[in-house]
Amino acid sequence: IIPVEEENPDFWNREAAEALGAAKKLQPAQTAAKNLIIFLGDGMGVSTVTAARILKGQKKDKLGPEIPLAMDRFPYVALSKTYNVDKHVPDSGATATAYLCGVKGNFQTIGLSAAARFNQCNTTRGNEVISVMNRAKKAGKSVGVVTTTRVQHASPAGTYAHTVNRNWYSDADVPASARQEGCQDIATQLISNMDIDVILGGGRKYMFRMGTPDPEYPDDYSQGGTRLDGKNLVQEWLAKRQGARYVWNRTELMQASLDPSVTHLMGLFEPGDMKYEIHRDSTLDPSLMEMTEAALRLLSRNPRGFFLFVEGGRIDHGHHESRAYRALTETIMFDDAIERAGQLTSEEDTLSLVTADHSHVFSFGGYPLRGSSIFGLAPGKARDRKAYTVLLYGNGPGYVLKDGARPDVTESESGSPEYRQQSAVPLDEETHAGEDVAVFARGPQAHLVHGVQEQTFIAHVMAFAACLEPYTACDLAPPAGTTD
């Protein structure tokens, strides 16, 4: 299926010359950023970006790799070193501390320096580090958190929480001893640590007392409230803020985002994580793109600007299940959200960053033909005379033996959204990977994103670009379009 024009050297020379021309025209903006957006693809390593690019191209009936993703169009790129202070291969909690607070931490801790120890409540106090979002709020900006996971999950929690254990979602998850020592669950911190203008994602059950039925699944006790302290955190949040609204479905979200009287918005669309995009009921639950659009509508009203965190959080979950179909369709929706945000904002005054917290042991190989399905089989057979898929995992639940041997695979199996790609090592869950991840940047001060950097550099670039602590003396011209 080789396109005829690609056989001609002129095609490639012309394309490269155009790219070179665009590169030569790049002018680093010398102004500060009024707005900051960080798009976090959880688990979106470079192999995931490449495979998602091909799938998104193939979804448009093209061959695949030649069609750029929205994130591919960002002019500046760097590599980020994702290790935690105590682990070569990191988790999403300590990485969130790095790219959101600018300080590396220990595995499974959030918003704390590495002087804090996992699960040891008494190491919390005095080791808190402050997120760029918190600093943006103190500077008078509006702030928002959007995710496809629970809003109390590791990545979003990095914007507002300080905890020695990322799994302390509600007080029911916090050991009694830690509660007595004064350690608060993440849901409590969500409503009390700082004033967040927009909160959109999953995580209803951590906000309500045990026994509270869920509005969407009233007959399923396991989906109801989990809190032991009897509190209704949503009610507490609403009571503290005039113009605040709580919504739990897509229709209510759309209405609230268009209502000028709404100044604060909390939308929790599932008891736990939101559904995978392929399982989403589009009448009940908003997509990541729709949540991003709603957040931008509200946040854009502030003349001082905004900080927005947008997470494609279930890319990671698809990979942990060794289900590439899920991971890649989540990545495409994440990229759609980036594209929509680009249409609703200006690169003159908005610094947009796209990155991942870590990678996964997800590989793409086997010499597949151009234009062949990303979920397809490699052209040849393996040494065991069986077929193998071009997408594979180094470890995970895809390791299965059939009569003591690796099972054969057919194309009608490998395309299924439920199919688990095979792996070399059997694990209940596929693991993160430790290689560097990409950082894409566009907007004021995006040119600072270059080379190979520590993951902490991301937070510092955002803080500097918006002249936030500790860079209030940034010496940058005011953002484009402002006069003060």
Epitope: Q58, K60, D61, S282, S373, F375, S412
Partner: nanobody, 121 residues
């Protein structure tokens, strides 16, 4: 999830025609490429035709000029018009859906249950 339900199969004389339909259950049907496969007794399932999100169409060499695939996004339905049928077209015909024509023609995500087409000589 996408549920696919085929209809229109049956018994027909060689040289005759049949029109297969496949109704999809998902609202975002128009985002999916749709295809038809067939499986004759004792043989592997083989690709017949596919129509992409953008309207691009592909056919297997064995059916080119005889079969026509089309879709109606308003009705969430894809059709396979089969003319000049031959005994070797006898098979169970399966509807399939996938993310783009490349994917659906090789590794469909979703399959229907199939409808039997028998061409007698």
């Amino acid at each position: 999830q996408v549920q696919l339900v085929e209809s229109g199969g049956g018994l027909v004389q060689a040289g005759g025609s049949l029109r297969l339909s496949c109704a999809a259950s998902r609202r975002s049907f128009s985002e999916y490429a749709m295809g038809w496969f067939r499986q004759a007794p004792g043989k592997e399932r083989e690709f017949v035709a596919a129509i992409g999100w953008s309207g691009v169409i592909e056919y297997a060499d064995s059916v080119k000029g005889r079969f026509t695939i089309s879709r109606d996004n308003a009705k969430d339905t894809v059709y396979l018009q089969m003319n000049s049928l031959k005994p070797e077209d006898t098979a169970v015909y399966y509807c399939a859906a996938g993310l783009g024509i490349r994917v659906v023609s090789q590794t469909p995500a979703y399959w229907g249950q199939g409808t039997q087409v028998t061409v007698s000589s």
